[in-house]
């Protein structure tokens, strides 16, 4: 049965940021600020009606 | 650098995998100026069944 939703896995590097342990902890300011910026950015990119949102954001060292 | 991994959701049939990647790549310059994020090494793939539950008959 089709859900009517398509999911895409997306991965990219942010080369001007340094990874540190605070990006492993969702309660830190660094984690939350980066997550907010990325979420906002994707809402800007995929402005068209079909975009439903993003989930499962993970950060790891590059 | 920081590697970001995430899952994007779209209404079925509204975008193909090529445009997901193309639209993201075309935004990289603005991402740098607006969010101070220098983005590279973009990779996009569809999330395979069963997660996306897209095995339905046409």
């Amino acid at each position: 049965l089709s859900t009517g939703v398509s999911f895409f896995f997306l991965s990219f590097h942010i080369s001007n940021l340094q990874f540190n342990s605070s990006l492993e902890d969702p309660s830190t300011d660094y984690y939350q600020e980066l997550q907010r910026d990325i979420s906002e950015m994707f809402l800007q990119i995929y402005k068209q009606g079909g975009f439903l949102g993003l989930s499962n954001i993970k950060f790891r060292p590059g | 650098s920081v590697v970001v991994q995430l899952t994007l959701a779209f209404r079925e049939g509204t975008i193909n995998v090529h445009d997901v990647e193309t639209q993201f790549n075309q935004y990289k310059t603005e991402a740098a100026s607006r969010y101070n994020l220098t983005i590279s090494d973009v990779s996009v793939s569809d999330v395979p069944f069963p997660f996306s539950a897209q095995s339905g008959a046409g």
């Epitope: 398509s6 068209q48 009606g49 079909g50 | 079925e12 049939g13 509204t14 975008i15 193909n16 995998v17 090529h18 193309t22 075309q26 569809d46 395979p48 069944f49 897209q54 046409g58």
Partner: antibody, heavy 120, light 107 residues
Framework: QVQLVQSGAEVKKPGASVKVSCKAS????????MHWIKQAPGQGLEWIGY????????HYNQKFKDRATLTADKSASTAYMELYSLRSEDTAVYYC?????????????WGQGTLVTVSS | DIQMTQSPSSLSASVGDRVTITCRAS??????LVWYQQKPGKSPKLLVY???TLTDGVPSRFSGSGSGTQYSLTISSLQPEDVATYYC?????????FGSGTKLEIK
């Protein structure tokens, strides 16, 4: 009504270049992507690449990347495909085709085709 | 690259017959499958998109179906004007490959 009118047939020698035009009318040229397709005599269809005339963004089939250039003149509502270093296997009908607008993944209008013959 | 395997390469059928052409993709193309009809000396014409949506003005005897990697185009009752070559196309990812075509003739 939407129309894509292509330039006339061309005969070229091996090693030469050819530039095929596709004049669009009946819609806003900059809001639809224009694709180019090759059809060799008696053969099937082969996708060459596309241009987004609004942003000038192009994407090519790797097979054609080194020998084809897609451009667009917004003021003339015309898309162009230039093919370089022609060889006999480039003899084909070349079509421009408009991709439908948002979430429209198909070619809804095609040009009439331009026959390019490469012969010494 | 996604390869599109179309079969049969040619087909001869009688007026009124039910005809089915199939197209197999080498990977899941998520219903981003298009069918075109090309008559001799003419440009291709859009028939079906999103695997099963009939474009405006196309007779209802045409229908598309399938999902994942397997797709088909069916003509429920073949008419003389349906003589043409039919192509499927992957519109999921670049390069936007076409099937090799099915030449349909009337017996």
């Amino acid at each position: 009504q939407v129309q894509l009118v292509q330039s006339g047939a061309e005969v070229k020698k091996p090693g030469a270049s050819v530039k095929v035009s596709c004049k669009a009318s009946g819609y806003t040229f900059t809001t639809y992507t224009m694709h180019w397709i090759k059809q060799a005599p008696g053969q099937g269809l082969e996708w060459i690449g596309y241009i987004n005339p609004g942003s000038d963004y192009t994407h090519y089939n790797q097979k054609f990347k080194d020998r084809a250039t897609l451009t667009a003149d917004k003021s003339a509502s015309t898309a162009y495909m230039e093919l370089y270093s022609l060889r006999s296997e480039d003899t084909a009908v070349y079509y421009c085709a408009r991709q439908g607008n948002y979430a429209a993944y198909y070619f809804d209008y095609w040009g009439q085709g331009t026959l390019v013959t490469v012969s010494s | 690259d996604i390869q599109m395997t179309q079969s049969p390469s040619s087909l001869s059928a009688s007026v009124g017959d039910r005809v089915t052409i199939t197209c197999r993709a080498s990977g899941n193309i998520h219903n981003f499958l298009v069918w075109y009809q090309q008559k001799p000396g003419k440009s291709p014409k859009l028939l079906v998109y999103n695997a099963k949506t009939l474009t405006d003005g196309v007779p209802s005897r045409f229908s598309g179906s399938g999902s994942g990697t397997q797709y088909s185009l069916t003509i429920s009752s073949l008419q003389p004007e349906d003589v043409a070559t039919y192509y499927c196309q992957n519109f999921w990812n670049v390069p936007f490959t076409f099937g090799s075509g099915t030449k349909l003739e009337i017996k």
